[in-house]
């Protein structure tokens, strides 16, 4: 298999790539001769061979054409050659040699006549493996590769020469090259082709950031004399909207974003947001969804919450406790707070005005985090409407109408006292019938009763409220053989009284009914 030439080698001469005759100078003419041959991969090539092994004192020279130096300071000569073992050649003991010599001569122009004495010897080249005639049958030629360094070279170019002193040798290929540190990208910084110095010192090279990136630390690398990059220092990082992919900063695809410069990857747009273009630094919210000014781009877009539910007022003379349930839809945020708008109304509810500043709200009127507030210092026998706004971090960005629940009350001197006793009249698997007596102090006309109940094992995490006009009620759709907790309070025009204590009753385990049973607490 052909082994590719290393990327850090720049050829100045490669005899294998020259089409047609090489046309090098052979002196004397009957010494080195140019012939067609094949390389180790059976590719046709032009080679030079000499095999003048009969005569003593051979001195056959072969000189290449002029080779431009380009930017090289140190050059490398790679010789691939085949050397025949002298023992495989009959009749020639004593005259046959198994080495040849490599020379070079620097020159600023390429019309120089060949003169032996102007050449400087690089080395004597010997084969690691010579071959006997017997190796030739299936073309198992022992191909030797020898590399020699020359330098520093200063003139515009040079010649190479090969001196044969009586060997049987074929030059299969001659390659002259210099080493460079090749263009590379390291830590998202580009380093250009760099020719090293001939000396042992390293060349410091400053890198430039690839497109769509910026310096984190100034990128630098060192180019060694062997054409190798060493000691990367510093780096570049991809800009916002771009992520590292291989050796480049690639734009985030639609549907992805990257908010800041750095090594992070592009992230998928958070819920209820999207991007339509490449290279997004953040994602745009869908219609009717918003992101608060201080929200990070990684946060999902949200909408205002729905209105609070199940508002309950508990009037005590000129005070009222308002309770409500959390909105069904939080809008996708946790920062929900509640604001109380207080309106004092005439006997016509449409004629209202803001409450007096003397009205007090506990713990406060705005920014409530719990679902209860106590309003005090109201006027007696006065109609009030309370609007409970649910807001979150994006409510102020939204144009739709406010999300609130309203409750209207009339203050009085007092609310009814608690219901004292609850009696179970009848039970079945799915229902319980209850009755009770009116509070001892109704403090007005009782309008209705609020019955609150829940399964005992659920510890009031989920409860149900229903209204009863009289002093008895049948509660259905219950679970069989289950203990329920009940509380009842009365409501007059002044509001709700306080809850009764908790009463526990059980549904039947099977289909028969049980009557008349007081509760156990």
């Amino acid at each position: 298999e052909l082994s590719p030439q290393p990327s850090n080698e720049v050829n100045l001469l490669d005899s294998k790539t020259i089409q047609g005759e090489l046309g090098w100078i052979s002196y004397p003419s009957h010494g080195w001769e140019e012939i067609s041959g094949v390389d180790e991969h059976y590719t046709p090539i032009r080679t030079y061979q000499v095999c003048n092994v009969m005569d003593h004192s051979q001195n056959n020279w072969l000189r290449t054409n002029w080779v431009p130096r380009n930017s090289a300071q140190k050059i490398y000569v790679e010789l691939k050659f085949t050397l025949r073992d002298c023992n495989s050649i009959p009749l020639v003991l004593g005259t046959c040699k198994e080495t040849f010599n490599l020379y070079y001569m620097e020159s600023d122009d390429h019309g120089v006549k060949f003169r032996e004495h102007q050449f400087t010897k690089i080395d004597t080249i010997a084969a690691d493996e010579s071959f006997t005639q017997m190796d030739l049958g299936d073309r198992i030629l022992k191909l030797n590769t020898e590399i020699r360094e020359v330098g520093p070279v200063n003139k515009k170019g040079f010649y190479l020469a090969f001196q044969d002193v009586g060997a049987c040798v074929a030059l299969v290929s001659v390659r002259v090259y210099f080493k460079k540190c090749p263009f590379t990208v390291k830590n998202l910084a580009m380093f250009p082709d760099t020719v090293p110095m001939d000396s042992q010192s390293l060349v410091e090279v400053r890198g430039s950031c690839v497109n769509n990136s910026k310096e984190e630390d100034p990128p630098r690398m060192y180019c060694s004399t062997e054409g190798e990059w060493l000691v990367p220092i510093g780096k570049c990082t991809c800009n916002a909207g771009y992520e590292e992919r291989g050796f480049i900063c690639q734009a985030c695809r639609p549907g992805f974003y990257k908010a800041s410069d750095g090594a992070a990857k592009c992230a998928k747009c958070p819920p209820h947001s999207s991007t339509q273009e490449d290279g997004s630094m953040n994602c745009r919210c869908e219609n009717n969804y918003f992101r608060a000014e201080k929200d990070p781009p990684s946060m999902a877009c949200a909408r205002p919450p729905s209105a609070p539910r199940n508002v309950i007022s508990n009037i005590n003379e000129t005070s009222v406790i308002l309770d409500w349930s959390w909105p069904l839809d939080t809008g996708g945020r946790k920062d929900i707070t509640f604001n109380i708008i207080c309106k004092k109304c005439g006997w016509n509810v449409r004629q209202c005005e803001p409450c007096s500043p003397n009205v007090r709200f506990l713990p406060r009127q705005l920014g409530l985090t719990n679902t209860t507030v106590t309003v005090t210092d109201l006027l007696a026998h006065t109609n009030y409407t309370f609007e409970i706004d649910a807001v979150n971090g994006v409510s102020e960005l939204s144009s739709p109408p406010r999300q609130y629940a309203a409750v209207s009350i009339t203050t009085n001197q007092a609310a009814p006292s608690p219901v004292m006793t609850i009696k179970k009249d009848r039970t079945s698997r799915n229902s319980i019938s209850l009755s009770w007596q009116e509070p001892e102090h109704p403090n007005g006309i009782i309008l209705d009763y609020e019955v609150k109940y829940y399964q005992k094992q659920e510890q009031e995490t989920s409860y149900t409220i229903l209204r009863a006009r009289g002093t008895n009620v049948t509660i259905s759709s219950l679970k069989p053989d289950t203990t329920y907790v009940f509380q009842i309070r009365a409501r007059t025009a002044a509001g709700y009284g306080t809850n009764s204590r908790k009463f526990e009753f059980e549904t039947s385990p099977d289909s028969f009914s049980i009557s008349g049973e007081n509760s156990h607490v």
Epitope: H30, C51, I89, T95, Q133, G137
Partner: antibody
């Protein structure tokens, strides 16, 4: 140009001797070995051996008798084949051929025109 | 000594056709033979040596291949001047020739 020039035909009686010259020109005589090949009438080629033109050292083919001798006169760039005690079966064309050693293999790249030696009583 | 046997003894071909000549060694040799051409009344001429190297001036329609004991000389398209006798020759310490193959006009 490179050439090997041989003498004309010889007719000899059995038991006689003959010396066939081969004069080289156009190259350095001592730089290439010289080989001798014979070809009986209507027959194929038979390699007889060779001589190192530098040292004068000969090598004879297996089966060759001592009747064949290779020699040189390097001053006139000439190789000789001497056959003594000629027999009728020695009748053949005798070729000298320059030996070419190369890295990739050997062969005889330049041939003389041949000398016909006829042995007849 | 190694004996080289050439076949066929005579090969009849028309100009422009391909000719394939065989040379078989009596024992395995790693050195591919040299090949020679001889026309009537002329000295032999070296065609190929060293497995596949053509001698100076030999056209590229001549090629050689093989290894071990079986070797082949191929003339890709026979020209009129190619009708002759062809010999293979094994080299080494001792050289031997095959008996020859005559290529004649069909």
């Amino acid at each position: 140009q490179v050439q090997l020039l041989q003498s004309g035909a010889e007719v000899k009686k059995p038991g006689a001797s003959v010396k066939v010259p081969c004069k080289a020109s156009g190259y350095t005589f001592t730089s290439r070995a010289m080989s001798w090949v014979r070809q009986a009438p209507g027959q194929g080629l038979e390699w007889m051996g060779w001589i190192n033109t530098n040292t004068g050292n000969p090598t004879y083919a297996q089966g060759s008798t001592g009747r064949f001798v290779f020699s040189l006169d390097t001053s006139v760039s000439t190789a000789y084949l001497q056959i003594s005690s000629l027999k009728a079966e020695d009748t053949a064309v005798y070729y000298c051929a320059r030996v070419r050693f190369t890295v990739y293999g050997d062969g005889m790249d330049v041939w003389g025109q041949g000398t016909l030696v006829t042995v007849s009583s | 000594e190694i004996v080289l046997t050439q076949s066929p003894a005579t090969l009849s071909v028309s100009p422009g056709e391909r000719a394939t000549l065989s040379c078989r060694a009596s024992q395995s040799v790693s050195s591919n033979p040299a090949w020679y051409q001889q026309k009537p009344g002329q000295a032999p001429r070296l065609l190929i040596y060293g497995a596949s190297t053509r001698a100076t001036g030999i056209p590229d329609r001549f090629s050689a291949s093989g290894s071990g004991t079986d070797f082949t000389l191929t003339i890709s398209r026979v020209e009129p001047e190619d009708f002759a006798v062809y010999y293979c020759q094994q080299y080494g310490p001792s050289w031997t020739f095959g008996q020859g193959t005559k290529v004649e006009i069909k």
